[in-house]
């Protein structure tokens, strides 16, 4: 497969348009190299239709005039201005604003809780398997295997802190060296970025929103993957992370600190612990080859236990099995010895839904996975809707300017670094990079934050999660302090190295360009987002894992040709875009390859065949639910079915017409009506003041 889904001519062509969300779009300068192009064979067709006589706005736009899809949308304010309202209107508007704020905080709370439960669900479904990944002895000698184990385990348990704590306990008990642990930590860093990518998938309903959200989420993935791509070979060759962190750990006489403050958990834990509570020690025990742990359930049953350490007399086959010669005796028939036993007495059961069901972990995990994804999706939809209604006009302008504007010259370059600090600080407060980046995703989607601004915030989040780990390490007991601190520092310096690689010089901000490219592809072929997720977080790691188990020879035998092909394609791509003249005519574009190797169109047809039937059913269901909801809330005009259905109808009608952005309309109310956003009759009741 070629590296980009649509590969036409390499030369810039003003007549070619991007395959974007709203049909044909013009190529933006520079960005065209990153985005997908149409094939030579398919020329864009612009349809011009006559408009209804009442409209003075031109709905059909000339292809050349359409804005860059990455420009933030202007969230229009159709409401009455504050100054024009009477007292009653102002009071009503104030209370509406307060109500929206409460709702927003409520949905945000359940959004974070559902992320926590999603993590628990993943641990129940794949936690034991994740633990078994760690018990593989090849980790010690194969850094690539360590890396993919880090990715797989973190993806399976949906928590980098769980996977790193397993690594720490393994290093503390000498089952793993720090050197072998570093690739695992790098993998954990990659694995943790899946959460916000899943969250971005929830915004699949609106193409342009999804484009931004998915790109905003995957900028994290690309940063991590690219950092590993460069830093893992550097670490294997030089062991710089191991050496630096060892020097730091040895030069400081650290005293055991206090636990990192649990700020967000304090609020979410009372709710999440009513849903499910897990005994996370089980995964660590499996990782450390504890046979008994394999049969233990991850679902915590007893929350209050009394542990009593006693010495009991036990019979042994012979005196050779005695604890020590002095603790050995006979009763004349059997040999006895004294054994230290920890007697655990169960006092009180946990108070959560699954405590008395005695279901297998897989069943509980599956139930929670479905429920948490539904809640996550629901909360996300509501957050986006509320933010959409709040962030209009003046409010939106202020927020967008505050977040996305740079400092005045000559300090503009500092803005990004401040964003990194903000990201680190926010992550430290919420104690989870997944929560922070997942909360950021819908904001990128609705256009409050640009990807360029989200990037440093995400990098800061990566730093924030490592500072939390350092604090947690300082709170470790004596025997684990050194190893946990060194691993936390490795994680910290790995992220710092990554930032130094992919942030300071604008040219090196490859993750942004790659994420935008993927955003464009995923906006057109939305199934590709799921495909990307499966490939990058499951198939590639699992393939490397399988090949590594087969041995170095097999891994090199398969890996080297694959890497060679990738490098060859990348070089060819670079030459095609930079200096195509040096290439033979045939290689100046990808047309020499069959269509399925250079375009996603044939694949799209296959996927569409499979999903078409399901999509139709889904839309029918959606309409029924939607209408029922409208009847209940007594507003027959309020119902707009999901975007997926509209797109489906569009596809069936064969309308591939670029529509003007709302801000180009003369009559705002008409424009919003035309787009189906607001019923004309209800437009005057919109309240935007918060």
């Amino acid at each position: 497969m070629a590296p980009w889904p649509e590969l036409g001519d390499a030369q810039p062509n003003p007549d070619k348009y991007l395959e974007g969300a709203a049909g044909q779009q013009p190529t933006a300068p520079d960005k065209s190299k990153e985005t997908n192009k149409t094939d030579n064979t398919e020329a864009p067709v612009t349809k011009i239709e006559l408009l209804p006589s009442y409209s003075t706005a031109t709905l059909i736009d000339e292809p050349t005039e359409v804005d860059d899809p990455w420009n933030l949308p202007t969230l229009q304010d159709s409401g009455i201005k504050w100054s024009e309202r009477d007292t009653k209107g102002k009071i009503l508007c104030f209370f509406q604003g307060i109500g929206r704020l409460i709702l927003l905080l409520g949905f945000l709370y359940f959004f974070v809780c559902s992320l926590d439960i999603l993590s628990s669900a993943f641990q129940l479904v794949g936690g034991k398997m994740a633990g078994q990944f760690f018990s593989n002895s090849s980790i010690m000698s194969n850094p690539l295997l360590g890396l993919v184990i880090g990715v797989l385990v973190t993806v399976l348990v949906q928590s980098s802190s769980t996977s790193t704590s397993i690594v720490v306990s393994m290093v503390s008990s000498s089952l793993l060296t720090v050197r072998a642990a570093i690739p695992i930590i790098m993998g954990a860093n990659i694995g943790t970025s899946i959460t916000n990518t899943i969250v971005a998938l929830m915004q699949v309903g609106d193409r342009s929103e999804f484009r931004r959200a998915f790109a905003g989420a995957t900028v994290h993935d690309f940063f991590n993957w690219l950092s590993v791509l460069v830093l893992l070979p550097v670490e294997v060759a030089t062991h710089y992370l191991e050496i630096i962190t060892q020097l730091i750990v040895e030069s400081f006489h650290f005293k055991n600190g206090e636990d990192a403050p649990d700020l967000l958990k304090v609020i979410t834990k009372p709710f999440t612990k009513l849903i499910v509570q897990l005994d996370k020690k089980v995964i660590s025990q499996i990782a450390m080859n504890d046979e008994k742990a394999k049969n233990k359930s991850l679902v915590k049953i007893w929350c209050k236990t009394f542990t009593n350490k006693t010495q009991i007399n036990v019979t042994v086959p012979s005196t050779a099995n005695c604890t020590s010669p002095s603790l050995c005796w006979t009763d004349g028939i059997q040999n006895w010895t004294m054994k230290n036993v920890t007697y655990k007495e169960n006092i009180a059961k946990c108070q959560h839904i699954f405590v008395n069901f005695h279901l297998p972990d897989l069943a509980v995990g599956t139930i929670l996975l479905i429920l948490s994804l539904l809640v996550l999706c629901g909360c996300l939809i509501m957050i986006v809707k509320i933010l959409g209604s709040v962030l209009k006009g003046q409010v939106a302008t202020v927020i967008k300017k505050t977040i996305n504007t740079d400092f005045p010259f000559p300090f503009a370059w500092l803005t990004g670094y401040l964003a990194i600090l903000v990201g680190a600080g926010m992550t430290f407060i919420v104690q989870s990079s997944s929560v922070f980046t997942s909360a950021l995703t819908p904001l990128i989607g609705i256009g409050v934050i640009t990807i360029e601004r989200a990037y440093p915030l995400t990098l800061g989040s990566n730093i924030g999660t490592t500072t939390t780990a350092i604090l947690a390490a300082l709170a470790s007991p004596g025997n684990a302090l050194r190893s946990s601190l060194q691993i936390a520092l490795c994680h910290f310096f790995f992220n710092i190295s990554g930032i130094l690689l992919w942030y300071p010089i604008p040219f090196t901000r490859l993750p942004i360009r790659m994420a935008k490219g993927l955003g464009n592809i995923s906006a057109k072929y939305r199934w590709f987002a799921v495909f990307y997720l499966i490939i990058f977080f499951f198939l590639i790691p699992l393939t490397v894992f399988g090949l590594s188990l087969a041995g170095w020879r097999v891994l090199v035998g398969v890996g080297v040709p694959v890497v060679f092909i990738i490098i060859l394609v990348l070089c060819l791509r670079l030459l095609q875009s930079r200096c195509p003249r040096v290439l033979p005519k045939k290689l100046q574009n990808w047309n020499f390859l069959p269509l399925w190797m250079r375009s996603l169109k044939p694949w799209d047809a296959v996927v569409s065949k499979f999903t078409g039937c399901f999509q139709m059913r889904c839309c029918c269901c959606c309409r029924v639910c939607c209408r029922a909801c409208c009847l209940l809330c007594d507003c027959p005009k309020c119902c707009r079915c999901s975007k997926c259905c509209e797109d489906l109808e569009e596809a069936q009608e064969g309308q591939d017409v670029p529509v003007k952005a709302p801000e180009t309309f003369d009559n705002i109310t008409i424009s919003r009506e035309a787009q189906g956003e607001v019923p004309a009759s209800d437009s005057k009741t919109e309240c935007t003041a918060l």
Epitope: T319, S326, C328, W329, T330, D331, G332, Q334
Partner: antibody, heavy 119, light 107 residues
Framework: QVQLVQSGAEVKKPGASVKVSCKAS????????MHWVRQAPGQGLEWMGA????????AYNQKFKGRVTMTRDTSTSTVYMELSSLRSEDTAVYYC????????????WGQGTLVTVSS | DIQLTQSPSFLSASVGDRVTITCKAS??????VAWYQQKPGKAPKLLIY???TRHSGVPSRFSGSGSGTEFTLTISSLQPEDFATYYC?????????FGQGTKLEIK
């Protein structure tokens, strides 16, 4: 209270066998080992072996192996010790003693049975 | 087999005296040692087990100490009924063995 009542004195000829009984009462018979210890006239104590009435498991002192057999009858809470191929040096007082659970100290002893071996 | 050697074999003492009897094992027996008292014509009676633990009903004047290979039985204040033969026994390994005994007589 715990009581161990042994059978009466026996006089045996060399080469013969002797079977001494020990009836236990006052405790759960099957939980404690029953040891047999002998004491030759004017000599010290010598452990012969033990039986666990619960399962019938036995352990003998190598010195007596092949000559001594310990059995039990749980219905009557009685333990038997049979010593075959008697010799004159087997003349001694034979004691049964109940062993404390889990270790080899003997907390309660029978009154003893004098076995005299003479031609 | 583990040998136990008691010393002295004979001991003369008066009522009220403090008496110490020692027992040496040929190898480490931990604390798996018991002490018995036997009066003429009677069965032995358990005094101490686990080297230091007094059996129920045994007067407090009897005490045991030691671990490994050296053990002692101490009678803090001799009473008339204490004149008897004392045996140490190990139950560290089979066969169980007894010391040769220490005869305590009235001076």
């Amino acid at each position: 209270q715990v009581q161990l009542v042994q059978s009466g004195a026996e006089v045996k000829k060399p080469g013969a066998s002797v079977k001494v009984s020990c009836k236990a009462s006052g405790y759960t018979f099957t939980t404690n080992n029953m040891h047999w210890v002998r004491q030759a006239p004017g000599q010290g104590l010598e452990w012969m072996g033990a039986i666990y009435p619960g399962s019938g498991a036995t352990a003998y002192n190598q010195k007596f192996k092949g000559r001594v057999t310990m059995t039990r009858d749980t219905s009557t809470s009685t333990v038997y010790m049979e010593l075959s191929s008697l010799r004159s040096e087997d003349t001694a007082v034979y004691y049964c003693a109940s062993g404390m659970y889990g270790h080899g100290a003997m907390d309660y002893w029978g009154q003893g049975t004098l076995v005299t071996v003479s031609s | 087999d583990i040998q136990l050697t008691q010393s002295p074999s004979f001991l003369s003492a008066s009522v009220g005296d403090r008496v110490t009897i020692t027992c040496k094992a040929s190898q480490d027996v931990g604390t798996a040692v018991a002490w018995y008292q036997q009066k003429p014509g009677k069965a032995p009676k358990l005094l101490i087990y686990w080297a230091t633990t007094r059996h129920s009903g045994v007067p407090s004047r009897f005490s045991g100490s030691g671990s490994g290979t050296e053990f002692t039985l101490t009678i803090s204040s001799l009473q008339p009924e204490d004149f008897a033969t004392y045996y140490c026994q190990q139950y560290s390994s089979n066969p169980l063995t007894f010391g040769q005994g220490t005869k305590l007589e009235i001076k």
